[in-house]
């Protein structure tokens, strides 16, 4: 696993990554505990302390050494070297920068053989980002009169992100105001504790339901909208059903 | 490297208006919102407003709403900040800030008859 | 709006000293941003979304919290750290500031 705290943090899990030495019980290098090595990309804002860790077994026990892009990595490789734990298996990078960006890979290796696993790391200069909206969301969607319909929008956001959901509409007959602005109108917005902005649910639509809806997100960063359509049908004419998008409505921090 | 460069100092009587620029540089302007904060004379900070370069939009805090006018030339990459019936506890320090992390310079105000 | 208390609103240390400020917002928050500002001179980030250090800032300094309740730690002051501390909530407009935490040599 890999930390991106200000600190640098003690292993204090209890799982057992340093296996004691049996020479009946002789084998080559293996990994004993995956689970803290699935995440192979790693996106730590710059100045942050980053840890990778490869816990293993083996006997006699193994070695450990440290790849960087595929070369042996030195301490004077960068800026206030690093630091090997070996009895945790793992690589500590303080104060990170851009220039620790690349590919690091753990060779863990005995005389009965050599197992490796390479970790990603992006340094980013500045995490908070612009709201992310997944692609194909919210959906085209259509139904019949009397129907009902729900548009979802998923949104990606490392700051709190205030959620709109948007409609296009005519006064007087026009779409567009003096300013040539379009006339717009907020069916659904979050509050700060507010739940399912994510969601749009029109209940009993009539042919006046029909058109763009657009999901604006901002935070204090930025901005990120996508809109999708909604097409009603005349009641004897059944829908088109499109292909069902089941994604979890809430957005993910 | 990113710049946020403000107009100068200005001194105005009660009453009269002030328009302060905010000429961005160094990233894309219409991507982030440029926020307002201005800080009185041995003051802590105050938020009043923001605008989204790309379509216009703002977020005013309402204390100031209908004496803060937030404004933006894209062309120029600049964002500008109109207060106007000026008061003198309106003497501050006005700052222009994108992403939190990018700041103007600061322009001081100074509102005395 | 979410009103922030900052505490305490001075502070007298020495370099090499363990400092914490501490946050109370008037209702719960995703996240906090803490500034540290000179006389004279813009604010500049600290900490953003609670406990990320914004680039460049020495790793000295740390942020946590959750909820209504956000503290800044400075591990061990050094002298370029006398300054006034802010907190900042992004997340509900109107987005607002603490009154700020003066830290003075002792």
């Known amino acids: 696993d890999a930390i991106s705290s200000g600190d640098d943090e003690d292993d204090t899990d209890s799982s057992e990554d340093f296996v004691s030495e049996n020479r009946s019980n002789q084998r080559a290098p293996y990994w004993t505990n995956t689970e803290k090595m699935e995440k192979r990309l790693h996106a730590v804002p710059a100045a942050n302390t980053v840890k990778f860790r490869c816990p293993a077994g083996g006997n006699p026990t193994p070695t450990m050494r440290w790849l960087k892009n595929g070369k042996e990595f030195k301490q004077e490789h960068r800026i206030g070297g690093y630091k090997v734990r070996n009895q945790h298996w793992s690589l500590i990078m303080e104060s990170v920068v851009p220039s620790d960006k690349g590919n690091y890979t753990c060779l863990v290796e005995n005389e009965y053989g050599s197992i490796n696993h390479t970790y990603h790391l992006d340094v980013v200069e500045r995490s908070p980002h612009r709201p992310i909206l997944q692609a194909g969301l919210p959906a085209n969607a259509s139904t019949v009169v009397g129907g009902d319909v729900e548009f979802v929008c998923k949104v990606y956001s490392d700051a709190q992100p205030h959620i709109q959901w948007i409609k296009h509409v005519e006064k007087n007959g026009s779409k567009y105001g003096p300013d040539g602005l379009p006339y717009l109108k907020v069916l659904k917005h979050s509050g700060i504790n507010s739940s399912n902005a994510e969601v749009l649910a029109l209940f009993n639509v009539t042919e006046m339901d029909a058109g763009e809806y657009i999901c604006k997100v901002s935070n204090y960063i930025g901005q990120a909208n996508q809109s999708a359509w909604l097409t009603v049908l005349p009641k004897q004419q059944a829908p088109v059903r499109e292909k069902e998008i089941t994604a979890s409505p809430d957005y993910l921090e | 490297e990113v710049q946020l460069v403000q107009s100068g100092a200005e001194v105005k009587k009660p009453g009269a208006s002030v328009k302060v620029s905010c000429k961005a540089s160094?990233?894309?302007?219409?991507?982030?919102?440029m926020h307002w904060v201005r800080q009185a004379p041995g003051q802590g900070l105050e938020w009043m407003g923001a605008?989204?370069?790309?379509?216009?939009?703002?977020n005013y805090n309402q204390k100031f709403k209908g004496r803060v006018t937030l404004t933006r030339d894209t062309s120029i990459s600049t964002a500008y900040m109109e207060l106007s019936r000026l008061r003198s506890d309106d003497t501050a320090v006005y700052y222009c800030?994108?992403?939190?992390?990018?700041w103007g310079q600061g322009t001081t105000v100074t509102v005395s008859s | 709006a979410i009103q922030l208390t900052q505490s305490p609103s001075s502070l007298s240390a020495s370099v090499g000293d363990r400092v914490t400020i501490t946050c109370s917002a008037s209702?719960?928050?995703?996240?906090m941003s803490w500034y540290q500002q000179k006389p004279g001179k813009a604010p500049k980030l600290l900490i953003y979304?609670?406990?990320n250090l914004a680039s460049g800032v020495p790793s000295r300094f740390s942020g946590s919290g959750s909820g209504t309740d956000f503290t800044l730690t400075i591990s061990s002051l050094q002298p370029e750290d006398f300054a006034t501390y802010y907190c900042?909530?992004?997340?509900?407009?109107?987005?607002?500031f603490g009154q700020g935490t003066k830290l003075e040599i002792k």
């Open positions: 979304d609670t406990s």
């Open positions: 160094g990233y894309t302007f219409t991507n982030y919102w």
């Open positions: 209702s719960g928050l995703s996240y």
């Open positions: 605008i989204y370069p790309e379509n216009g939009d703002i």
């Open positions: 800030t994108s992403r939190g992390d990018y």
């Open positions: 900042q909530q992004w997340s509900s407009y109107p987005y607002t």
